[in-house]
Interface confidence: low
Amino acid sequence: QRFAQAQQQLPLESLGWDVAELQLNHTGPQQDPRLYWQGGPALGRSFLHGPELDKGQLRIHRDGIYMVHIQVTLAICSSTTASRHHPTTLAVGICSPASRSISLLRLSFHQGCTIASQRLTPLARGDTLCTNLTGTLLPSRNTDETFFGVQWVRP
Amino acid sequence: QRFAQAQQQLPLESLGWDVAELQLNHTGPQQDPRLYWQGGPALGRSFLHGPELDKGQLRIHRDGIYMVHIQVTLAICSSTTASRHHPTTLAVGICSPASRSISLLRLSFHQGCTIASQRLTPLARGDTLCTNLTGTLLPSRNTDETFFGVQWVRP
Amino acid sequence: QRFAQAQQQLPLESLGWDVAELQLNHTGPQQDPRLYWQGGPALGRSFLHGPELDKGQLRIHRDGIYMVHIQVTLAICSSTTASRHHPTTLAVGICSPASRSISLLRLSFHQGCTIASQRLTPLARGDTLCTNLTGTLLPSRNTDETFFGVQWVRP
């Protein structure tokens, strides 16, 4: 159904517009494939307006449809590094609450050293997004090569 | 802090919604790695609503957080063309004012012939975005293969 | 020209915000390069709010500038599958009405198995978007690997 038949006026706050852009803080310890993120003006051009970080993972504060985007660049990489013998894959998903756990976006580094994608997905308040990097290759921490963000689009 | 605690009504103009989608005009002369862009209805499906072009570079007119996106396809390219012997890299950054110069987004063509990515970033009125293509390979000018755009997202 | 000099108040409905995110249903029969899409809550995380599906193709219901995005992953693929000898290409375009037929976004799988991109483009009510995958390789139907969506951005 259409999202607003009623013609009510909208205050800015009700538009939502929650938005976050994060930079890589660090990778997880052995056996933890998650990437840990950080954000805030003191760190450069990353920020959180609405969503929050919970132990390096992004937690949503407002229900709605979001545009989720990510770019990850492998740190020590040539076109031969990421071959099918050592598949390196990035997956973005809801990791908690467990009842809503699902993979939202998945990409493999075949003969490339960077993946970048984006998608629209419904998210709910309390959803925590995790980004799992499987394989033996390490991501670059350069802020223009590796970043992760969300943008609230509509209710 | 949250961007609007006050519940004021919003006129359309104040929403900003500055937006631009550009097509490649030409590459720079020797020693100038910048791509020069063009936009406008007469050129096809490119446009500028708010931002302006300054000698082929995109200048921002409204402060805010923007979604910046780009796709560049190399013109004469096979999966072997862009090898480790000839690294071709695309970088999008603020190139003026000099005090705000920074690289926002960077990708290398490893064994691929197209890069595409997007990110959220704060931009200020007067910021000029430059797209630098380093390497010996030329970009395609096909409007469905190479394009660059920004979208105002929120204050 | 600026899109709204008048300072009129905006009801939510007039903001548009038409949005859709689709998952792959099936490929076309021999000689039909189109991908056929599906969407709706019963299918998972795909949805249509405004646009509609017409025989698996996405039809726009509201004039405006849209962000179009897509990711397609090849199903049986290694880094050598899509080689220079055998180009597999994805093109997103307006396929009807015929008078507005145009390619909006095009990418080739060179030595990669996934393409992902996005662009801003003006679309009009009644425009139908088709996604053509040329070549003999089949796309993955995993919902986190292959998806297609649009987001209304502004009038």
Partner: antibody
Framework: QVQLVESGGGVVQPGRSLRLSCAAS????????IHWVRQAPGKGLEWVAV????????YYADSVKGRFTISRDNSKNTLYLQMNSLRAEDTAVYYC???????????????WGQGTLVTVSS | DIVMTQSPLSLPVTPGEPASISCRSS???????????LDWYLQKPGQSPQFLIY???YRASGVPDRFSGSGSGTDFTLRISRVEAEDVGVYYC?????????FGPGTKVDIK
């Protein structure tokens, strides 16, 4: 099913020319690179030439470079080998072979024709 | 040009027994993408060659699993775990890394 059928072989005098054809069926010819491979009587295999799916690139063995020309007509699903200035050592069975790249790898000749015999003799 | 050598050039075999053929290249066939561009073909008597192994160790479609390929760089081996009568013929390795592609001289396998 995939089929490659060579034709055009025969007996020819040294210094003369001959054109071989390879008719393809059962697959999308315009998607595949195609090779010519030859085998002299009682000898091993020798790669001769390759042409890209769209004809944009062609490569040759040193032994035939400048004398042989590989070409294709995708509208006719046909591959050609124009052989000029023929020599006795060009005597061989000539096979066309499809490049297997589209089957999931980019090396290997996955389908071969039955071959056509070229005899260069005075 | 890359030169390919094979050994032995002739290999008498007993059905049911294993057999192996060696192939060497004058320079590495390990491509920048991590794959070894070395293929194996079998030419049975009176027939066109048929595809066996690609990229060093990957069996082509329809090839029985008694055939296996191994090796990297410049040294490669084709193994038949249990030879069958239908396996007789000449086995060729080929450099498919760069043009000109070059075949080895072939190894003739026949029943003792």
């Amino acid at each position: 099913q995939v089929q490659l059928v060579e034709s055009g072989g025969g007996v020819v005098q040294p210094g003369r020319s001959l054109r071989l054809s390879c008719a393809a069926s059962g697959f999308t010819f315009s998607n595949y690179g195609i090779h010519w491979v030859r085998q002299a009587p009682g000898k091993g295999l020798e790669w001769v030439a390759v042409i890209w799916y769209d004809g944009s690139n062609k490569y040759y063995a040193d032994s035939v470079k400048g004398r042989f020309t590989i070409s294709r007509d995708n509208s006719k699903n046909t591959l050609y080998l124009q052989m000029n200035s023929l020599r006795a050592e060009d005597t061989a069975v000539y096979y066309c072979a499809r490049d297997g790249g589209y089957s999931g790898y980019d090396s290997g000749f996955d389908y071969w024709g039955q071959g056509t015999l070229v005899t260069v003799s005075s | 040009d890359i030169v390919m050598t094979q050994s032995p050039l002739s290999l008498p075999v007993t059905p049911g027994e294993p057999a192996s053929i060696s192939c060497r290249s004058s320079q590495s066939l390990l491509n920048s993408n991590g794959y070894n561009y070395l293929d194996w073909y079998l030419q049975k008597p009176g027939q066109s060659p048929q595809f066996l192994i690609y990229l060093g160790s990957y069996r082509a479609s329809g090839v029985p699993d008694r055939f296996s390929g191994s090796g990297s760089g410049t040294d490669f081996t084709l193994r038949i775990s249990r030879v069958e009568a239908e396996d007789v013929g000449v086995y060729y390795c080929i450099n498919s890394l760069q043009t000109p592609f070059t075949f080895g001289p072939g190894t003739k396998v026949d029943i003792k």
